[in-house]
């Protein structure tokens, strides 16, 4: 008897199985339930991504894929040679022995054998397709990264050669360094040896000077004390010139012109015959207010009255428009001369403003103002300037055109800000503008990135605070 | 006309942040190094620290140095100063100016340090 029956075994794989008598042939076909679903990128008929893959990922790939390739290729052998090698002694048995149905049950399970192998070689096809398709990408991919390396390569070539230029430089410069570090080295030592020898010289410069400190005061006094007596002796030899003197006298009497007594600046002190430098008593113009001043004979021939001096920091120069106006501190140290007296001098005759100004580290400098005078109260002193000389800035730090005198009680500057209240001092303010010789006073070390300090834009930059600076006047014609 | 607008202050309470922010016209403000300064109740300025033109160095006071940071953007004419780890004494008006001949100063943005 025959039989033909297809069914599953327990692994869930198709078999086929053929009873012929005694005989029981059974076909194990290759599972194409284990190739993946469609919604796999891998799927053989999917169409190929163009997203290029990580270089691991496809390489391990185009593995899985040969591998399959190859087990398929192994299996189709062996059915073939297993159907050669089996197949013709089972099918001559056949051929004799069954009937005309079981050539029809061959002939389906052989057709069906063929379907599968047709599916097979199909599904191969496209691998096979996918695996060129990917292997072209690889090699375009290995192209460009060939490409790169290459290029990286020069590069890396040229900065080597550029890196070994440098070093070759370093090396020179570095000599260089050691050779200057050798003569520094030596200019140090020397320069520290002269430094010694100068505190030794200073020290005793100190102690002289100090001694020439206390002459001068008394120098002073008792050269206003002379001016004093100097006048008292004056009234007192014209009253007796004028008593002896009568209108029936024959003998002339030369009464001798009285010598002038009152003086408005210290130039007219200066042409008077009083050459030294000190404190001297100064009458207001067509006025016999008085006003102390300090009078500079020395400095560029003399005849300076000094306005406004600042050297240690012992007088506050935050102070009102009153004060400001009148004047305040003493003409022996730091002082402002007053802005009313100023402005009365400067209005009646053309003077000359002389600034002098003194860094920490022992450097001195000057401005000169050819033309210089206050307005009136009434202008809020505005300042007036023109023709500037000298070694403290080619550009004015006062501003021009002139702007109107401010304290912190009087607000006139051109400023959201409030520059007297916050800069300290009254000055002749713009937006702040580029000096501030009535700022704060600040010690040595103290003196950098002071906003508020003794400012001269132009000479030393907007954080420097002054050691010391003079503010004098002379007449344009003296 | 030139102008130098600070804002950006306020109450803030101790270990707080900050940021002042200075708005700058009038003047070619990548030519300048600016400053920020402040002024305690009752006492005179303080600088607080400084940038330069191009905004590659900058200086702090010792007071602020770790815990204010200036900068600037000179496409936005802005200075500005990141104020962190704030203190009661950093209680004050604070000021940005330009180190310009004139010394350009705005009107000043108060900040307050309190629990």
């Known amino acids: 008897y025959s039989n033909f029956r297809k069914s599953v075994d327990s692994t869930g794989r198709r078999q086929y199985q053929v009873q012929n008598g005694p005989c029981s042939y059974t076909f194990l076909l290759p599972e194409t339930d284990s190739c993946r679903s469609s919604s796999s990128p891998y799927m053989s008929n999917a169409v190929q991504r163009d997203a290029p893959l990580d270089y691991d990922d496809s390489v391990q790939r185009l593995q899985v894929l040969e591998n399959i390739l190859e087990n398929n290729t192994q299996w189709l052998m062996k059915l073939e040679n297993y159907i050669q090698d089996n197949m013709k002694k089972e099918m001559v048995e056949i051929q004799q022995n069954v009937v005309q149905n079981q050539t029809a049950v061959m002939i389906e399970i052989g057709t069906s054998l063929l379907n599968q192998t047709a599916a097979q070689t199909r599904k191969l096809t496209d691998v096979e397709a996918q695996v060129l398709n990917q292997t072209t990408r690889l090699e375009l991919q290995l192209l460009q990264h060939s490409i790169s390396t290459n290029k990286l390569e020069k590069q890396i070539l040229d900065q080597t050669s550029e890196i070994n230029k440098l070093q070759n430089k370093n090396s020179f410069l570095e000599q260089k360094v050691l050779d200057m570090e050798g003569k520094h080295s030596e200019q140090l030592q020397s320069m520290k040896e002269q430094k010694d020898e100068l505190q030794v010289l200073v020290s005793k410069q100190s102690s002289v000077i100090d001694e020439l400190e206390k002459k001068l005061v008394t120098a002073t006094v008792n050269n206003s004390l002379l001016q004093k007596q100097q006048h008292d002796l004056m009234e007192t030899v014209n009253s007796l010139l004028t008593m002896m003197s009568s209108p029936n006298s024959k003998s002339s009497v030369a009464i001798r012109k009285e010598e002038q007594t009152t003086f408005r600046d210290c130039a007219e002190i200066f042409k008077s015959g009083l050459t030294t430098s000190g404190i001297y008593t100064l009458t207001f113009p067509n006025s016999t207010e008085e006003i102390k001043a300090y009078c500079d004979m020395d400095v560029g021939g003399g005849g300076w009255t000094v306005i406004q001096h600042r050297e240690d920091g012992s007088v506050d120069f935050q102070r009102t428009w009153k004060e400001y106006k009148e004047g305040f501190g003493s003409p022996l140290g730091e002082y402002w001369l007053g802005n009313e007296f100023v402005s009365q001098l400067t209005g009646q005759h053309r003077y000359v403003l002389k600034i002098q100004l003194k860094d920490w580290e022992g450097n001195e400098a000057h401005s000169l103002y050819d033309h210089f005078y206050l307005a009136g109260e009434e202008s809020n002193y505005r300042i007036h300037l023109t023709g500037l000389t000298g070694t403290a800035g080619k550009i004015s730090s006062i501003s021009q055109p002139g702007s109107d005198f401010s304290t912190k009680d009087s607000d006139n500057d051109k400023c959201i800000c409030k520059c007297s209240q916050m800069l300290s001092g009254g000055w002749w303010f713009d937006a702040c503008g580029p000096s501030n010789l009535n700022g704060q006073y600040y010690p040595q070390k103290q003196n950098t990135n002071k906003f508020n300090g003794i400012k001269w834009y132009y000479w030393k930059g907007s954080g420097y605070s002054l050691k010391a600076t003079t503010m004098m006047i002379r007449p344009a014609d003296f | 006309e030139v102008q130098l607008v600070e804002s950006g202050g306020g109450l803030v309470q101790p270990g707080g942040s900050l940021r002042l922010s200075c708005a700058a016209s009038?003047?070619?403000?990548?030519?300048?190094?600016m400053s920020w300064v402040r002024q305690a109740p009752g006492k005179g300025l303080e600088w607080v620290s400084t940038?330069?033109?191009?905004?590659?160095?900058?200086g702090y006071a010792d007071s602020v140095k770790g815990r204010f940071t200036i900068s600037r953007d000179n496409s936005k004419n802005t200075l500005y100063l990141q104020m962190n780890s704030l203190r009661p004494e950093d209680t004050a008006v604070y000021y940005c100016?330009?180190?310009?001949?004139?010394?350009?100063w705005g009107q000043g943005t108060t900040v307050t340090v309190s629990s």
């Open positions: 009038g003047f070619t403000f990548s030519s300048y190094a």
């Open positions: 940038i330069n033109s191009g905004g590659g160095r900058t």
């Open positions: 100016n330009a180190d310009h001949p004139q010394g350009y």
